[in-house]
């Protein structure tokens, strides 16, 4: 529907509260360095303007596009040039180029201070003093640090954040009530951000078709009883929603997501038997619940895939006349039968099937050429199965921390040019696959593990894209979205790497390490491990283990010492010397 005023349309659809929240998220995701107060001022100005348009859609400027209105507003920021440098040049462009320019300047790793959690009493006081500002600040801080966070989902997080404070600030033991809830929100938020970042990368780097293929596979696994036409409709709508959110069109995205949730709930009978509970919830909870809903049971009487996709005389004709529909049907039929496969594996199988048809259909005897196509799937299925089996065994043997360390060493040897903080962050997250997925039965391990690894490796890809240092990373990240994980798995030690010069400062530690949380202490040790491997890429597991054990003992000893700083200085020198000797540095 064409509306006289887009801004009035969205304001009316979303309501003032959601409108303001979404505009704040949009602005914070674009101008990540701007102070909170500046953003609030801009949001209030936009909201007041929207209200005038609701009152009279023919009022001046009300017919302008949201990109024009928001872009004009962002470009009024006085400090744009000194704060953002060349991003200010975006303001010289016209829409749609201006919005594209803003999108290109989104920073996945903004130079912002780490969010430090204040004392519980301080937070509760701030919450009670000004609840609205407190919650806006939450949206602002998350949005600017995660410029691709799925905006309607961030509203859901904010609702849970508010509920946590409302409940816990009245509790007898505020901290015991609140801190676990905040930890859970933080961890879920990071996971949600990373998952959405992969969706945006899929759309922006590999195009709409890549995203649609992913969505067909995932929704077919989730809704195996739904007809292909129904799944196709959901995929089209879901693609629109994510295209909008990834493109900064947050008001349209949130509005369309609500419409999609409404449609799904109105048509649950033809979609899935698992939606009933979700559909009884309020909007934000409903959308979240649908997005996370468990797979429905597979229909009992599904025929063999071979009939339609190998044995039929019309295979090649159907393929050539409508590849998107025919391959979409193949993916749908395969995925609904295989909830035990990862989405990326299903996409690899579909790609193999397509490649085989493209090769065979023009041949003299197409059927003879493609008759054994399903046999080609076997090694593709076995590769992730074997990898997951091996790594889960390793995880069970080592535990999470040591499993992360094994991955740190493995990945540092593969791509030693990558920055140490990125290697630590990515390897720690890769290592979490163990506790996240290895507990599952065989049938759930692969979709859990490989699709999670896709999300984590995308973090590596987006961080590396900002400052590219390794051709191998670039190659694995850009050649094929579905083969990223196999590409990284196949990388061997980089023999071209010239070891880093030894720098004693890198291995100098101070008493402040003793006051760190267990997690932060692990990160310090893992940072040292990466640096060790960069200095000595050919070091054996045994050598590295010996040095790391000595390091752990050194930290433990000095943290127990009366004069911690002296201990770290003196024992540290000895440790560095011993480590150099042990590694032959």
């Amino acid at each position: 529907d064409a509306h006289k005023s887009e801004v009035a349309h969205r304001f009316k659809d979303l309501g003032e509260e959601n409108f303001k929240a979404l505009v704040l998220i949009a602005f914070a995701q674009y101008l990540q360095q701007c102070p909170f107060e500046d953003h609030v001022k801009l949001v209030n100005e936009v909201t007041e303007f929207a209200k005038t348009c609701v009152a009279d859609e023919s009022a001046e400027n009300c017919d302008k596009s949201l990109h024009t209105l928001f872009g004009d507003k962002l470009c009024t920021v006085a400090t744009l040039r000194e704060t953002y440098g060349e991003m200010a040049d975006c303001c010289a462009k016209q829409e749609p180029e201006r919005n594209e320019c803003f999108l290109q300047h989104k920073d996945d790793n903004p130079n912002l201070p780490r969010l430090v959690r204040p004392e519980v009493d301080v937070m509760c006081t701030a919450f009670h003093d000004n609840e609205e500002t407190f919650l806006k600040k939450y949206l602002y801080e998350i949005a600017r640090r995660h410029p691709y966070f799925y905006a309607p989902e961030l509203l859901f997080f904010a609702k849970r954040y508010k509920a946590a404070f409302t409940e816990c600030c009245q509790a007898a033991d505020k901290a015991a009530c609140l801190l676990p809830k905040l930890d859970e929100l933080r961890d879920e938020g990071k996971a949600s951000s990373a998952k959405q970042r992969l969706k945006c990368a899929s759309l922006q780097k590999f195009g709409e078709r890549a995203f649609k293929a992913w969505a067909v596979a995932r929704l077919s696994q989730r809704f195996p009883k739904a007809e292909f036409a129904e799944v196709s409709k959901l995929v089209t709508d879901l693609t629109k929603v994510h295209t909008e959110c990834c493109h900064g069109d947050l008001l349209e995205c949130a509005d369309d997501r609500a419409d999609l949730a409404k449609y799904i709930c109105e048509n649950q009978d033809s979609i899935s038997s698992k939606l009933k509970e979700c559909c009884e919830k309020p909007l934000l909870e409903k959308s979240h619940c649908i997005a996370e809903v468990e797979n429905d049971e597979m229909p009992a009487d599904l025929p063999s895939l071979a009939a339609d996709f190998v044995e039929s005389k019309d295979v090649c004709k159907n393929y050539a006349e409508a590849k998107d529909v025919f391959l979409g049907m193949f993916l749908y039929e395969y995925a609904r039968r295989h909830p035990d496969y990862s989405v990326v594996l299903l996409l690899r199988l579909a790609k193999t099937y397509e490649t085989t048809l493209e090769k065979c259909c023009a041949a003299a005897d197409p059927h003879e050429c493609y008759a054994k196509v399903f046999d080609e799937f076997k090694p593709l299925v076995e590769e992730p199965q074997n990898l997951i089996k091996q790594n889960c065994e390793l995880f069970e043997q080592l535990g999470e921390y040591k499993f992360q360390n094994a991955l740190l060493v493995r990945y540092t040897k593969k791509v030693p040019q990558v920055s140490t903080p990125t290697l630590v962050e990515v390897s720690r997250n890769l290592g979490k696959v163990g506790s996240k997925c290895c507990k599952h039965p065989e049938a759930k391990r692969m979709p859990c593990a490989e699709d999670y690894l896709s999300v984590v490796l995308n973090q590596l890809c987006v961080l590396h894209e900002k400052t590219p240092v390794s051709d191998r990373v670039t190659k694995c990240c850009t050649e094929s979205l579905v083969n990223r994980r196999p590409c990284f798995s196949a990388l061997e030690v980089d023999e071209t790497y010239v070891p880093k010069e030894f720098n004693a400062e890198t291995f100098t530690f101070h008493a402040d390490i003793c006051t760190l949380s267990e997690k932060e202490r692990q990160i310090k040790k893992q940072t040292a491990l990466v640096e060790l491997v960069k200095h000595k890429p050919k070091a054996t597991k045994e050598q590295l283990k010996a040095v790391m054990d000595d390091f752990a003992a050194f930290v433990e000893k000095c943290c127990k010492a009366d004069d911690k700083e002296t201990c770290f200085a003196e024992e540290g020198k000895k440790l560095v010397a011993a480590s150099q000797a042990a590694l032959g540095l």
């Epitope: 090649c316 050539a320 493209e358 090769k359 259909c361 041949a363 003299a364």
Partner: antibody, heavy 121, light 110 residues
Framework: EVQLLESGGGLVQPGGSLRLSCAVS????????INWVRQAPGKGLEWIGI???????FYATWAKGRFTISRDNSKNTVYLQMNSLRAEDTAVYYC???????????????WGQGTLVTVSS | DIQMTQSPSSVSASVGDRVTITCQSS???????LSWYQQKPGKAPKLLIY???KLTSGVPSRFSGSGSGTDFTLTISSLQPEDFATYYC???????????FGGGTKVEIK
């Protein structure tokens, strides 16, 4: 040496029919897909259709109904039957082989020299 | 409707110049089903590039192709006398019946 050689072009009246031939030498035609492409004087290339090795045919939307592609593997020849010809069908008609290993991609590695068809009263 | 728009329609250049020809497709081509052809007057077209960036055997390395989705480019890094010709892009889509060529770009001597 592999060669594709078109023949059968010439002057034809509007509403008339014509059958073009594409004789292939140097390879066994039965293993390859052959396309017909045309080019009006001073204009660009226009894909007409394809016949796969198995004999399955596909046509550009505008060519469906008036144009028919067939093959005779024993003669190593592909044909283009054109009916209800119009002045705008005046062009050089080429036959071209699809690169082996592709079925639906626009990759044509071997071309004939072309035959001119003129539709005029 | 399928649209394959080539630009510029003609370009005047000198030997040694770098020449760039673009091809814009609507909708996007199927995967990277995009080819580039060279045609000289009175001759049949010659396949230069397939899958958007792969050089056909025997084609000089001064020719290169790039792009994906809807936007593609043919670059001649250093124009040689034998490169003066008309260049066409060809696109393959979800349906084979939509196979289309661009309008052509004539590379002329300045």
């Amino acid at each position: 040496e592999v060669q594709l050689l078109e023949s059968g072009g010439g002057l034809v009246q509007p509403g008339g029919s014509l059958r073009l031939s594409c004789a292939v030498s140097g390879i066994d035609l039965s293993n390859y897909a052959i396309n017909w492409v045309r080019q009006a004087p001073g204009k660009g290339l226009e894909w007409i259709g394809i016949i796969w090795a198995s004999g399955t045919t596909f046509y550009a939307t505008w060519a469906k109904g008036r144009f028919t592609i067939s093959r005779d593997n024993s003669k190593n020849t592909v044909y283009l039957q054109m009916n209800s010809l119009r002045a705008e069908d005046t062009a050089v008609y080429y036959c071209a082989r699809t690169v082996p290993g592709y079925s639906t991609a626009p990759y044509f590695d071997l071309w004939g020299q072309g035959t001119l068809v003129t539709v005029s009263s | 409707d399928i649209q394959m728009t080539q630009s510029p329609s003609s370009v005047s250049a000198s030997v040694g110049d770098r020449v760039t020809i673009t091809c814009q497709s609507s909708p996007s081509v199927w995967l990277n089903f995009l080819s580039w052809y060279q045609q000289k007057p009175g001759k049949a077209p010659k396949l230069l590039i397939y899958e958007a960036s792969k050089l056909t055997s025997g084609v000089p390395s001064r020719f290169s192709g790039s792009g994906s989705g809807t936007d593609f480019t043919l670059t001649i890094s250093s124009l040689q006398p034998e490169d003066f010709a008309t260049y066409y892009c060809g696109g393959g889509y979800s349906s084979i019946s939509d196979t289309t060529f661009g309008g052509g770009t004539k590379v002329e001597i300045k």
